[in-house]
């Protein structure tokens, strides 16, 4: 066959889906690597091909489209199951092509197994909350395009194993559910199932999500350098080790970029050439407030570096703070023998 | 299409056990859940309790803790349900259904299996 | 325990006639409400879920509603494969339970 373009294997797209649940999944190459969708391919003549290879094989073999009740069929660039069933995990391919043009791509679909609790090797999207913050919500996720809209579902939302009803300040509204007022105790493992009739047969869809509460933006602050500070003296004689830590605090921002750094003599430390290393640790709160400390760390330090200015800088979407360390040279104690003796008139 | 086949009628002493199946087929035996149900002749329906063949898990009423026993068998695709201590009163049919969460609980019965305690 | 009551126990009704049958929690639960029908000497047969959807193959004639603890299937017009026994079940929390039960015969 003539030279086709394929695009390899999308590990980016790595779909999961549940066992014996309808799966819709459309076609890579439309929505990641070709620069025109499936109507104007279509309308110009091309075909899309689907095949797949099963796990743990390499042969290459066409889709079955004539499946009993179809449970797999094509629609436009959509591969259908309805439903899954576990031996469709593998790497399905869609290929674009007509005489001229040929382009691929494959992706791996893996069909996963859920325990009574919901628990599965499923990668669950997160959804952030504020805590405190007044009414937020979450959507039931990934269920558009699986009944038209004249179809109305029912849908039951539960956290961990249990049905949420009669919870405080947790309220199921269809596809919605409402937090009244966020707190740290709705941290969990949120799942809606929906179930919806299609041509005479019932169909449940389920979806989990994590839920994780965090900082609200009402209460975030700038970042604050906990250290260094006035309180503190870095003294040291030449060729003592060095050792000054910056400790700054940030408020969870969503999508803030926090960031930390050393300056010496106003110079970032790769542009200097003393032989300094810097060392940094990361710690959270349990609403993703942040804790990042750097430790500027100079193994053998001289008169010179004693002399420099060290200073702590850190930035976020709030703002941009630095504090400069109190470093000094540490006057040698007077030796007994001789400073003492000499303050004493001694001959 | 979605089936469960019960196993047939038992016959029993008081103080004995007896253990009936419920096999499915047509679907993914261990995606839903199972759930039993007692009806004593010209009585009404009575929940006895529910497993998960996925990975095994039961609720039951509290009436039939330590009664029931609800286990499943995932390579045959068969519940099974197990009655100990018997007595008159436990001379019922016993239906299994087929239920998934949250919405849609009960959809596909058994025919039942009746299970008379005579001595 | 959730108790469900289920009236009329037992009723005549005509074919053609529209028949109402209700069920009443002893709590609100939340439309976590079943309805089947039995036919003697048969399994039961699920008709509707969640209060108000109606079952894959379940005729347009039969409809449930409610909300809260008050519950209701109403049949359109009667017609005789929908004479047997009516339960209603609450699947809002466990244990599940059921109605006693309405007999529905030909008057």
């Known amino acids: 066959s003539e030279r086709c373009d394929d695009w390899g294997l999308d590990t980016m797209r790595q779909i999961q889906v549940f066992e014996d649940e309808p799966a819709r999944i459309k076609c890579p190459l439309f929505e990641h690597f070709l620069k025109f969708n499936y109507s104007t391919a279509h309308s110009a003549g091309l075909t899309l091909i689907w095949y797949w290879t099963r796990q743990d094989r390499d042969l290459e073999e066409p889709i079955n489209f004539r499946l009993p009740e179809n449970r797999i069929s094509k629609e436009k660039d959509v591969l259908w199951f309805r439903p899954t069933l576990l031996n469709d995990t593998g790497n399905y391919t869609c290929m674009l092509r007509n005489t001229t043009y040929c382009s691929k791509v494959a992706f791996p679909l893996e069909v996963v197994q859920k325990d009574s609790c919901f628990n599965s090797p499923m990668k669950l999207p997160v959804h952030k909350l504020y805590i405190e913050y007044g009414i937020q919500r979450i959507t039931c996720p990934n269920v558009d395009g699986y009944f038209p809209s004249s179809v109305k579902p029912t849908i039951t939302w539960y956290m961990g194993c249990y049905k949420i009803q009669n919870f405080n300040n947790v309220i199921p509204e269809g596809m919605n559910l409402s937090f009244l007022i966020a707190l740290i105790s709705n941290n969990g493992n949120y799942t809606c199932v929906v179930t919806y009739p299609e041509n005479g047969r019932t169909f449940h869809l389920t979806r989990t999500l994590t839920v994780k509460v965090v900082g609200s933006p009402k209460n975030a602050v700038p970042p604050v350098i906990h250290s260094p500070n006035d309180h503190v003296v870095y003294e040291k004689e030449p060729g003592e080790e060095l050792l000054i830590p910056c400790t700054v605090y940030f408020s969870f921002l969503m999508d803030s970029r926090n960031e930390v750094w050393w300056t010496i003599d106003g110079k970032k430390p790769d542009d200097i050439t003393i032989d300094v290393t810097i060392n940094e640790s990361i710690s959270h709160s349990r609403t993703e407030d942040e804790t990042r400390t750097q430790i500027l760390s100079i193994k053998k330090v001289t008169s010179e570096d004693l002399k420099r200015s060290y200073v702590c800088h850190a930035r976020s979407a709030k703002g941009e703070v630095a504090k400069a360390a109190k470093v000094k040279q540490k006057v040698p104690a007077p030796r007994y023998t001789v400073e003492l003796a000499c303050g004493f008139g001694a001959t | 299409q979605v089936q469960l086949q019960q196993s047939g009628a038992e016959l029993a002493r008081p103080g004995a056990s007896v253990k009936f199946s419920c096999k499915a087929s047509g679907y993914t035996f261990t995606s839903y859940w199972m759930q039993w149900v007692k009806q004593r002749p010209g009585q009404g329906l009575e929940w006895i309790g529910t497993i998960y063949p996925g990975d095994g898990n039961t609720r039951y009423t509290q009436k039939f803790k330590g009664k029931a026993t609800l286990t499943a068998d995932k390579s045959s695709s068969t519940a099974y349900m197990q009655l100990s201590g018997l007595a008159s009163e436990d001379s019922a049919v016993y239906y299994c259904a087929r239920g998934y969460f949250g919405n849609l609980v009960f959809d596909v019965w058994g025919a039942g299996t009746t299970v008379t305690v005579s001595s | 325990d959730i108790k469900m009551t289920q009236s009329p126990s037992s009723m005549y009704a005509s074919l053609g006639e529209r028949v109402t049958i209700t069920c009443k929690a002893s709590?609100?639960?939340?439309?976590?409400l079943s309805w089947f029908l039995q036919k003697p000497g048969k399994s039961p047969k699920t008709l509707i879920y969640?209060?108000?959807r109606l079952v894959d193959g379940v005729p347009s004639r039969f409809s449930g509603g409610g909300s809260g603890q008050d519950y209701s299937l109403t049949i359109s017009s009667l017609e005789y494969e929908d004479l047997g026994i009516y339960y209603c079940l609450q699947y809002d929390e466990f244990p599940y339970t059921f109605g006693s039960g309405t007999k529905l015969e030909i008057k």
């Open positions: 969640r209060a108000d």
């Open positions: 709590q609100d639960i939340n439309t976590y």
